[in-house]
């Protein structure tokens, strides 16, 4: 048995007569043989669920669900209740109604076995019938909404009449009907004004019925019509078995470059027309098991269940359903030497499904794990300026497909063929598994004998120690020019274009700093600043070379304070700045300030 509503509303007036009928509560059956029996909770409750007093005023007919006053609620009774309401004015009280034998203990009141009946209290006597508006004669102030379980026997779930009005104003004629489309499963009995279902409902066909209740009031010669929404929601039960959309029960996957733990290798989708179990219960009651295969597969893969509500069209309306994505996920990083093919089976069980048929599906994943061989191009041939400063980035080495790698740890090393010309260094970038080539020793760059640098690049997979090699030829270009005296170590210190471009700084590939002119649009990512190379600094990312020394690009790498209009970078540096940003790495400070508009004019004049 279950209530067709979780809450009911009615009005209470001072000195309303004992015996006044208040309202009906309705229960619907889960099985044809069930007979409802109603019981009232012992207490009246007030604001914030405060227990006010034992209920001495309202009774229920156990078999019909009729609530009525068995004792008039006078002023003194009301005062007594108000005192206990934690100092709040008492405007509403409620009672709990239970369905016996569903719940014999008065605790939490939860649908379906308990409903709350709210009474709005009016500190006046019942108004004169002639003063009542048609709306007040027809419907309670709070609009009702109904819950009906699918596949259950039909039954009565509502009674339209406002009983106190009918009882106290017998001369006013009130008639009701339901406006509904053809073939809907509801009827309103003209004599009893009871609304019932004609047949069992199927949520998978229709989940919501937005009906309209029409009330016609006859008072003397006057006739008025009032319409209110009459919404019915059909509640789901697990009566649909899981299925494969388009019959797809197999997914094939190749594991090659993405070998990192938590990588989703393949996904299979299961459709269930039901939306139960509810999300809290779903993963416990809708189980997926990776069936025992070889130990390696059990250790290497896991299945993740990702349920999602969706909506599907049924008979011209949309009803909710569930799609379950089952993702085959790597449980660990896979070595590049791993090479095997297997079929994995996953058993999905909708454990609440009662049939007919089985609530079980078997998912198949065909997985090929391919080995990755490390390849480098046979040669790289790059150039570097003889004026380049330490940490200048001059190139990138990358094993074949390195940008696609994840979970593969490749380290790059340089082996120089000329001991005295070991100018370059390499650092491995974790983001794209590449190696960034940079100037490590500027003195060697200036030696006449070091006009061409010869290296062997060695890429090593850390897990398997497999290697790939490439020849790296670097020509040293141009002539060396000593820089101006008094230039700072970091390009970022310079606040003006002129002083920026006449100096070099750490990380500068040309031996000169570059000025980046901003767009002047408030706090912007494109702020004006002085940089060793605008290709890499600032770009909102402190790269693996820039981490070597804070003087290279504090705009991207500073962890200190930024003064002025800015947006901080994640996790460091300046994401956006106002005007011109310059930095003092030693002091761990950057300043973003409005552009000095007079400055370029002055520079031109002073030339």
């Amino acid at each position: 048995l279950y209530f067709s509503r979780d809450a009911y509303w009615e009005k209470l007036y001072v000195d309303q007569a004992a015996g006044t009928p208040l309202l009906y509560v309705h229960a619907l059956r889960d099985a044809p043989e069930e007979v409802p029996s109603f019981r009232l909770g012992q207490h009246l409750y007030g604001t914030y669920r405060t227990r006010l007093h034992e209920n001495n005023w309202i009774c229920i007919q156990e078999d019909t669900g009729l609530l009525y006053l068995n004792r008039s609620l006078d002023h003194s009774s009301w005062e007594k209740l108000s005192v206990r309401n934690r100092g709040f004015p008492l405007l509403t009280v409620y009672l709990k109604v239970f369905l016996s034998p569903t719940s014999l203990r008065e605790g939490e009141c939860q649908w379906p076995g308990c409903a709350r009946v709210y009474f709005s209290f009016f500190n006046t006597s019942f108004p004169a019938c002639s003063s009542l508006k048609p709306r007040e004669l027809c419907f309670p102030e709070t609009r009702p909404s109904f819950r009906i379980r699918e596949n259950r026997p039909p039954g009565t779930f509502h009674q339209f009449r406002l009983l106190p009005v009918q009882f106290l104003c017998p001369n006013i004629s009130v008639a009701y009907r339901l406006l509904e489309g053809e073939g809907l499963p509801f009827r309103c009995a003209p004599d009893s004004l009871e609304v019932s279902t004609r047949w069992a409902l199927d949520r998978e066909q229709r989940e919501k019925y937005e009906l309209v209740a029409v009330c016609t009031v006859h008072a003397g010669a006057r006739e008025e019509v009032v319409m209110v929404p009459f919404p019915v929601t059909v509640y789901d039960e697990d009566d649909s078995a899981p299925t494969f959309p388009a019959g797809v029960d197999t997914a094939s996957a190749v594991v090659e470059f993405k070998r990192k733990e938590d990588t989703v290798v393949a996904t299979l989708r299961v459709f269930d027309a039901d939306v139960v179990p509810a999300s809290g219960e779903l993963v416990r009651r809708y189980t997926s098991t990776l069936l025992p295969g070889d130990t390696w597969a059990q250790q290497t893969f896991r299945v993740e269940h990702w349920p999602n509500e969706t909506s599907v069209q049924a008979n011209g309306s949309f009803v909710r359903a569930t799609v379950h994505d089952y993702r085959l996920v790597l449980n660990r990083n896979l070595s590049i030497s791993e090479n095997r093919t297997m079929q994995l089976a996953v058993l999905v069980n909708d454990s609440d499904f009662q049939g007919p048929g089985a609530g079980v599906l078997l998912l198949h994943f065909n997985v090929s794990v391919l080995p990755v061989s490390l390849h480098l191009p046979s040669t790289y041939s790059l150039s570097v300026s003889r004026r380049a400063r330490r940490f200048a980035q001059i190139g990138k080495v990358c094993v074949e497909n390195c940008q696609a790698f994840s979970g593969i740890n490749v380290q790059y090393k340089l082996h120089s063929s000329g001991a005295n010309c070991s100018t370059l260094g390499v650092v491995t970038s974790a983001e794209d598994t590449s190696g960034i080539l940079f100037v490590n020793d500027t003195k060697a760059l200036r030696r006449p004998k070091c006009a061409e640098l010869h290296y062997m690049v060695v890429a090593t997979d850390q897990q398997t120690s497999r290697q790939a090699q490439a020849q790296l030829l670097v020509t040293v270009e141009g002539s060396y020019v000593a820089e101006e005296a008094g230039c700072p170590l970091s390009c970022a210190v310079s606040k003006r274009r002129l002083e920026c471009e006449e100096c070099g700084g750490l990380g500068s590939p040309t031996g000169r700093c570059e000025w980046r002119q901003g767009d002047g649009k408030g706090i912007t990512r494109n702020f004006s600043t002085c940089s060793p190379s605008t290709k890499t600094c600032p770009d909102g990312h402190c790269d693996v070379v820039e981490t070597q020394d804070i003087n290279i690009c504090p705009q991207d790498c500073l962890r200190g304070s930024i003064v002025g209009g800015h947006e901080p970078g994640e996790p460091r540096g300046i994401k956006a700045g106002y005007g011109t940003c310059n930095c003092f790495p030693e002091e761990e400070k950057c300043f973003c300030e409005p552009e000095d508009i007079q400055d370029p004019l002055c520079d031109e004049l002073c030339r």
Epitope: P377, T379, Y380, S381, L382, S383, V384, S385, A388, A392, Q393, I394, G395, K396, V397, C398, G418, C421, P448, K449, C450, A451, E452, L473, T475, P509, T510, S533, K535, T536
Partner: antibody, heavy 117, light 110 residues
Amino acid sequence: EVQLQQSGPELVKPGASMKISCKASGYSFTGFTMNWVKQSHGKNLEWIGLINPYNGVTNYNQKFRGKATLTVDESSSTAYMDLLSLTSEDSAVYYCARHYSFAMDYWGQGTSVTVSS
Amino acid sequence: DIVLTQSPASLAVSLGQRATISCRASESVDGYGSSFMHWYQQKPGQPPKLLIYRTSNLESGIPARFSGSGSTTDFTLTINPVEADDVATYYCQQNSEDRTFGGGTKLEIK
């Protein structure tokens, strides 16, 4: 297969400027510096300059400073040469050529530029 | 700039014979333990093609009939034996100081 595909022939008026493109394929574009060479009258070869596509750093033959500007677009693996304030002296075939050691191992097919009023 | 002078300006050789082309630099082009001299072949309507790099290293795909030698200021390209397909203009190039090319030697078959 390494290929350097240059833009088509150009006829330009004196004083105008123009841009020649060189699209690289078949190798890692940022792994090799790019050279540009001028050949006049089907004979004299002159080195204009080079650019490292990774960082955009250039080195010019002093003679071509102010005449040629080298740039790259890493996303399309394309090198560009802007020729400025053209005169009849600039009529020639221009080549892009991949850097190999100090030599040039792969060459584009050449772009013929004729400067004439 | 270092000036490269090629000789002869043109050369006619019988098929199967040896062809020798000389390239003289106005100053030394040695550096880092090797000489920075390279040789190219150019056929009409085509771009130059690298034959020899760093004085004596044969570029991949080039027949062993081509060889290079020399040091400091005097360098030689030898083709032995000459084949009909070798008809072309040959250029030397140095890079000890910037990069300059020789004036070219035109090879013909006698």
